[in-house]
Structure formats: structure tokens, C-alpha cells
Amino acid sequence: KESCDVQLYIKRQSEHSILAGDPFELECPVKYCANRPHVTWCKLNGTTCVKLEDRQTSWKEEKNISFFILHFEPVLPNDNGSYRCSANFQSNLIESHSTTLYVTDVKSASERPSKDEMASRPWLLYRHHHHHHHHHH
């Protein structure tokens, strides 16, 4: 039942816990068949998602999946919030679920998630650092 629909593999309730000042790469896993779709990131502001125009992004191609990456170099406190990637494919707009970044300001390290909280929400630990990408603006 292989479909050639574009798929964006961001799960509902996806979350990342990150530190201000660190580099971070937010990945949008994209499956496509022939032509790579045009993918963008936006940040949720209430019910509207504001397109992130002048941000560093890159593609990483793997065998069966591609990643459209939003770079945070470094993470800033106001990067806290929910993000969504969208793909334009054959005049269709496909939107992902939102993924939430919880940014801890190093100045207020006491606000970091506790060990218990991290144990009960293991996906908070799911964090990627990839290098050698072709970056573009």
C-alpha cells in the first residue's frame, strides 16, 4: 500500500526540552516519491502560524527519508513555543502536527524539568545534533 502522498512524520504531542545558548536542530522528517516538495517552518502564535522567513534551514537526505531542518544557533529564550512544518505538493498544502520546544534559560536552571519529569516524558530527551549540512537562508 505504498502511497506517493507526501508525509510529514511529526507526531502529535511531540516535544523537545532544550537549553538556551545551545545549538539545536529541529527536524521535519519528509517522505516524498519523485519531486521534493517545498517545505517551510512556521511558529504558532495563538491559532495562526507565522512563517519563519529569514531563518537558517537545510535539507538532509537519507535513504528512505529526508529532513528539512530549522537551525537554532544558538537557542534563545524566546524560541520557546510550538512549531509546524508544511509542504507544498502538487498544489496541496500538507501540514504537520505541532512540535513544542521548551527552552530553559541557563540563568534560571531551577526551571529545568526534573529527573522524574524527564523519566515520565522520555521524548523530551529526543534531541539531534547533526553537522556538515549545507545551510541556506
Partner: antibody
């Protein structure tokens, strides 16, 4: 061709822990979009979703049973294991595992044959 | 939890005639990604459930086109254009928009 098969004890005593294994073929649980859920059906009653494990080992549970459930995967063996603690006669049901396909989120497109678990002393 | 209410619970039908099952949810199933995660399953007597329809109206592979799904928000319908003997069984709706994922209580389709 995707197939799934549940295995485990047919009879457990109250307070015991149930361990069920779902052995599958036709897909890999390391592939993006893939997942496996456990669903149960008491005799003559409706279906109830229990737990789901995604390709990246992320897990979701039915909150009403979360404290009693664990779900794990062994990608190399093509298996998913569900454990349910403190079994009670009301947990008597046919337990199914189902393949979670992806179209923006999970949906179940293939189911195992089910295994009937009776809880009785 | 989102409660899925099906009606009728029992549906006696005549072979060759149409049949319709309703499913109502206590919350909208339209997700923030623009999709509606409402599925239908068929469970024939003594068998496992089988996927019929996903995302409200997409027919799963191998499902005859006499089955169709429609609806939006909180109200959904499964239709069988001409009932055949092999359609006997229990039909369940399911929502995958809100955790925990929940099923309807089932509608039993039987031949008159």
C-alpha cells in the same frame, strides 16, 4: 504482506502480571511512520485501545490503564511486548495487536487474530 | 475522553438494500493539522476487526467501493450502497484525533 500474531497465557490469576507478545512481519518498526498498538475486547463488548509504540520508541497509553501498562519493542526480533500488572477478572478479553500505518497520524490497517485472556482464580 | 456514540446499535437490513450507520463524537475530530482522524472498522463474526475507511472517507486497500464514509466535525456516517451477505458483522467507528484514542460501541448489521 503484513501479518501480526499475539501470543501469551490464556489464563492468569487475579493480581498476576500479564505479558503478551506481538510478533509481526511485512514491516519494520524502525521505519518512519510505523507503529504497533494493543487493543482489547471483552467478550461481547466493544473495543478499547490500550497502548501504542511508535518507530522512535515514543509511547502512548490509555490514561485509565497507564499505571498498569508497559509497552516495549524489539526491532531485531520484530516483536512488541505489552505487560499489564495487577490483573482482575474485568480484564478478561481478547487482546489484539494492530499495525499502525501513517497518514498524518496513526491509523490501524492490519490486526492480529487476537488472543483470549481469561482472568480467574 | 472523547465519547463516540453509534446509532443504531442493531441494524437489520435486506440484501441488496442500502444501510447507514451514524457516529457522533463529543468533541470535534478536526485536528490542528487540518485532517480528521475518523476511521471505520468491520468485525465479522468470530474474526478480528478489519479496516474499512480512514480519514473519514478514504477506502482502505481491498475494500469494496459499495462502502463509503462521510461527515465532518462531530457527525459521521458509514454507508453501504447495497448490502451483501458478507457484510454481516459489527461496525465500529474510531477517533485518532484526541488521546486516548476511542472506539464507538459498535453497530451490529444483520440480514432480515
Amino acid at each position: 504482506q503484513i501479518t501480526l500474531k499475539e501470543s501469551g497465557p490464556t489464563l492468569v490469576k487475579p493480581t498476576q502480571t500479564l505479558t503478551l507478545t506481538c510478533t509481526f512481519s511485512g514491516f519494520s518498526l524502525s521505519t518512519f511512520g510505523m507503529g504497533v498498538s494493543w487493543i482489547r475486547q471483552p467478550p461481547g463488548k466493544a473495543l478499547e485501545w490500550l497502548a501504542h509504540i511508535y518507530w522512535d520508541d515514543d509511547k502512548r497509553f490509555n490514561p485509565s490503564l497507564k499505571s498498569r501498562l508497559t509497552i516495549t519493542k524489539d526491532t531485531s526480533k520484530n516483536q512488541v511486548v505489552l505487560t499489564m500488572t495487577n490483573m482482575d477478572p474485568v480484564d478478561t478479553a481478547t487482546y489484539y495487536c494492530a499495525h499502525g500505518n501513517w497518514d498524518g497520524e496513526t491509523y490501524f490497517d492490519y490486526w492480529g487474530q487476537g488472543t483470549l485472556v481469561t482472568v480467574s482464580s | 475522553d472523547v465519547v463516540m456514540t453509534q446509532s443504531p446499535l442493531s441494524l437489520p437490513v435486506t440484501l441488496g438494500q442500502p444501510a447507514s450507520i451514524s457516529c457522533k463524537s463529543t468533541q470535534s475530530l478536526l485536528d490542528s493539522d487540518g485532517k480528521t482522524y475518523l476511521n471505520w472498522f468491520q468485525q465479522r463474526p468470530g474474526q478480528s476487526p478489519r479496516s474499512l475507511i480512514y480519514l473519514v472517507s478514504k477506502l482502505d486497500s481491498g475494500v469494496p467501493d459499495r462502502f463509503s464514509g462521510s461527515g465532518s466535525g462531530t457527525d459521521f456516517t458509514l454507508k453501504i450502497s447495497r448490502v451483501e451477505a458478507e457484510d454481516v458483522g459489527v461496525y465500529y467507528c474510531w477517533q485518532g484525533t484526541h488521546f486516548p484514542w476511542t472506539f464507538g460501541q459498535g453497530t451490529k448489521v444483520e440480514i432480515k
